[in-house]
């Protein structure tokens, strides 16, 4: 039975050149985190394997830098970075936990963020 | 260099029993997924099953559920694959493959060939 | 199951020519997708993973494309050395599946 619950970063702005954080948490489980995937829509951005380390997918690797922790930070933010991105957490026993965020990149200079949390 | 060697392979009866091996070098073994993967003669590629790193999560495809068995030993690096009540469609060549990631199979093994005939 | 259709099933083509393969999932399988090319007698060999990214050591001149349900692995410039049989295969889910192939022959 799958008890776990995933809290995300939500929906968040970020200025257009910046960077941002994405950051997803697993709570509520003992299960043991085998492996995250990140995906934005319908491509895979990076793998984080609890053995294997990081694979960050060769085309976004100039602008994909891995962590802190199981998280992804994204630099030099376009207005194509605006949209869903996925964090895929696979664990055992429980099986798989998705968590999502919507980024959107604005062009002012002023990026309201969404709600935060701290990961310890 | 990795390098993946089958083993086991040959000519059975139907409803007989083959065990097959893989044996596993120049890489961590034990960090890696591994699947087995068929081609019968003249036809494509269809998987048989997978096996997570640390054998907690095992897969299979419906063809073969309740008759074929996979594990590995990674004090051996090797995987297995156990074959009961073989059918002549169960004939092919079967290659064990490295699957980094769960998401890509980057090495194959050479294969080994399974007949199955009276 | 998630089924893979890949087109054409056969081509004939001369050296120096573009080749594009197409491989159609039956639902969405963002971009876990692979290529494979296979010679006859010998093991198949990953060219391009997640839809896009170049395996090691494969020629620049293999590209792959695509997300959701289309995908295509192009050659640039066929040479003699690319005539195979080309594989896709889904790892979204299991059961991984595969498309049927798609032989490229010479003209």
């Known amino acids: 039975m799958m008890t776990g619950t995933i809290e995300t970063t939500g929906n968040i702005s970020a200025e257009k050149g910046g960077s941002i954080i994405l950051q997803c948490h697993l709570s509520s489980t003992t299960a043991q985190v085998t492996q995250v995937n990140w995906e934005q829509q319908d491509q895979l951005l990076a793998i984080c394997n609890a053995d294997l380390g990081w694979h960050i997918s060769p085309s976004f690797k100039d602008r994909v830098a891995p962590g802190p922790g199981l998280g992804l930070t994204l630099q030099s933010l376009t207005v194509n970075d605006t949209g869903e991105y996925f964090c895929i957490y696979h664990t055992y026993p429980d099986g798989t936990y998705t968590g999502r965020i919507f980024l959107e990149v604005l062009e002012s200079s002023v990026a309201e963020h969404g709600a935060r949390f701290q990961i310890p | 260099e990795v390098q993946l060697l089958e083993s086991g392979g040959g000519l059975v009866q139907p409803g007989g029993s083959l065990r097959l091996s893989c044996a596993a070098s120049?890489?961590?073994?034990?960090?890696?997924?591994m699947h087995w993967v068929r081609q019968a003669p003249g036809k494509g590629l269809e998987w048989v099953a997978s096996?997570?790193?640390?054998?907690?999560?095992?897969y299979y495809a419906d063809s073969v559920k309740g008759r074929f068995t996979i594990s590995r030993d990674n004090s051996k690096n090797t995987l297995y694959l156990q074959m009961n009540s073989l059918r002549a469609e169960d004939t092919a060549v079967y290659y064990c493959?490295?699957?980094?990631?769960?998401?890509?199979?980057?090495?194959w093994g050479q294969g080994t060939l399974v007949t199955v005939s009276s | 199951d998630i089924q893979m259709t890949q087109s054409p099933s056969s081509l004939s083509a001369s050296v120096g020519d573009r080749v594009t393969i197409t491989c159609r999932a039956s639902?969405?399988?963002?971009?876990?997708l692979n290529w494979y090319q296979q010679k006859p007698g010998k093991a198949p060999k990953l060219l391009i993973y997640?839809?896009?990214s170049l395996q090691s050591g494969v020629p620049s001149r293999f590209s792959g494309s695509g997300s959701g349900t289309d995908f295509t692995l192009t050659i640039s410039s066929l040479q003699p050395e690319d005539f195979a049989t080309y594989y896709c295969?889904?790892?979204?889910?299991?059961?991984?599946?595969f498309g049927g192939g798609t032989k490229v022959e010479i003209k």
């Open positions: 493959a490295r699957g980094p990631y769960d998401v890509w199979l980057d090495y």
């Open positions: 120049g890489f961590t073994f034990s960090s890696y997924g």
């Open positions: 096996i997570k790193y640390s054998s907690s999560n095992k």
């Open positions: 639902q969405s399988i963002s971009s876990y």
């Open positions: 997640a839809a896009s």
């Open positions: 295969q889904q790892s979204y889910s299991t059961p991984l599946t």
